[in-house]
């Protein structure tokens, strides 16, 4: 029977090292069985290389094509093969479809003046041209209540977002996640980071204390707790 | 230590033929794009063709576009120039040059970093 | 197709100074920042030639440090600092950046 592409390709690059290509055919599919994606970047001299392509479904297919570092020149010419049928052609410039990379190592921490602190890691290297350009998106939620969820924006450099404990529910379980984007390449967002839980302790009258001196009060406690059920 | 010996220059009548060769040793040659230039008596350097590392890719002047094909052998580490239709105005010195290195997904550029000592072709009734 | 112009065509130094050489080219050679596609070449007499500068500015293995390439889009030049009389011959640009490849006329170095 004959092969066609219901959905033609689309592509994203991570503007350093991974362009993915993704396609849906119009009936189930063996994608690396059936078909191939050819890529050649339009540069004097470059060879064409071949993507096996993998199932994300039944009938869409998803390739991973390992790039050089970016740059805003490069165009490559795309060719989707099902044997000797040439399935569909097209280009795809990197630096017009740009999906940043996921950020990293999202953890909270207490800090002073009874905030949490949020810190991630920029995926990018310095020497990127990325690297300077991201500005993220944290969504914190409520564990147990759906409708209570805020959305933080975060224009600057630092990788950091400062969160008063007052704004969330005291003794309240809360998830962040973060995602990125680089305006200036009009880029989609990144997928989002995985998340990271933890507990808000805020009540009014500790507003005289630290969040560390809440902690270590905490810490008391169970150790307290912890050693009197030791004895009996 | 890099090398490239080039061969097959003649004395050739003109609307003749006539293949070079350029074998090639001390660098991985089927991870480079291999070019031939040519030099007129007293003239100037004139490019000519580049094909790259896989043989895959291949470019040619407008000068000898159609009259000139260039080929390699991987496995005897050789390029060639085959010559048909030759003219007066190809006499010339011919060099063979490493050029960039095409195995990665943009080819890395380093020039023409090496060059062969040339052959010398006549065309001449 | 690009063309690539060289001036002046001959030059004649004295053994210590500096010679410049200027190359243009009819199109930006430039594909992305830091990646100019423009190399500068040296023959001497009875020789093959000999790569000095790729990329607009980055010195081949082996090559003095007295080379020294410079600029971007379509305008470059060789500097040839404190010049020995081993520096005469002819010195070519050429562009790498499409096909047809291409070279300058050449510049003819005399030392005085």
């Known amino acids: 029977g004959s092969v066609k592409v219901l959905h033609e390709p689309s592509c994203f690059s991570d503007y350093i090292s991974t362009s993915v290509c993704q396609w849906k055919m119009d009936h189930p599919t063996n994608c690396s069985a059936e078909l191939r994606l050819s890529y050649q970047l339009d540069f004097m001299g470059s060879e064409n290389h071949t993507c096996v392509p993998e199932n994300r479904e039944d009938s869409v297919c998803v390739c991973s094509m390992p790039i050089d570092d970016a740059v805003e020149a490069d165009v490559y010419q795309l060719d989707l093969w099902a044997g000797q049928q040439l399935l569909w052609s097209g280009s795809f410039q990197p630096s017009k479809h740009v999906k940043p990379r996921t950020p990293g190592n999202l953890t909270v921490h207490p800090n002073i003046s009874h905030t949490w602190l949020l810190m991630w890691t920029n995926p990018y290297p310095t020497e990127n041209h990325l690297h300077s350009e991201l500005t993220y998106m944290v969504n914190v939620s409520n564990d147990n209540d759906p409708e209570d969820f805020k959305v933080y924006n975060v224009t600057y450099m630092g990788p950091t977002l400062r969160l008063a404990a007052s704004t969330l529910k005291s003794g309240a379980s809360y998830s962040a996640r973060v995602r990125a984007w680089a305006q200036t390449y009009n880029s989609t967002w990144s997928d989002w980071s995985p998340s990271t839980t933890w507990l808000n302790y805020y009540e009014p009258w500790e507003q005289h204390l630290g969040l560390n001196d809440i902690f270590e009060a905490q810490k008391i406690e169970w150790h307290e707790h912890h050693h009197h059920h030791h004895h009996h | 230590e890099v090398q490239l010996v080039e061969s097959g220059g003649d004395l050739v009548k003109p609307g003749g033929s006539l293949r070079l060769s350029c074998v090639a040793s001390g660098f991985p040659f089927r991870d480079y794009a291999m070019d031939w230039v040519r030099q007129a008596p007293g003239k100037g350097l004139q490019w000519l063709s580049l094909i790259s590392g896989s043989g895959g890719k291949t470019y040619y002047a407008d000068a000898v576009k159609g009259r000139f094909t260039i080929s390699r052998d991987n496995a005897k580490n050789t390029l060639y120039l085959q010559m048909n239709s030759l003219r007066a105005e190809d006499t010339a010195v011919y060099y063979c040059?490493?050029?960039?290195?095409?195995?990665?997904?943009?080819?890395?550029?380093?020039?023409?970093?090496?060059w062969g000592q040339g052959t010398l072709v006549t065309v001449s009734s | 197709d690009i063309v690539m112009t060289q001036t002046p065509l001959s030059l004649s130094v004295s053994p210590g100074e500096t010679a410049s050489i200027s190359c243009r080219s009819s199109q930006s050679l430039t594909y992305s920042i830091g990646y100019n596609y423009l190399d500068w070449y040296m023959q001497k007499p009875g020789q093959s030639p000999q790569g000095l500068i790729y990329?607009?500015?980055k010195r081949a293995s082996g090559v003095s440090d007295r080379f020294s390439g410079s600029g971007s889009g379509a305008d470059f030049t060789l500097k040839i600092s404190r010049v020995e009389a081993d520096d005469a011959g002819v010195y070519y640009c050429?562009?790498?950046?499409?096909?047809?490849?291409?070279f300058g006329q050449g510049t003819k170095l005399e030392i005085k």
């Open positions: 050429m562009q790498g950046l499409q096909s047809p490849l291409g």
């Open positions: 040059a490493v050029d960039r290195l095409t195995k990665t997904i943009r080819p890395q550029y380093y020039g023409l970093w090496s």
């Open positions: 990329l607009g500015s």
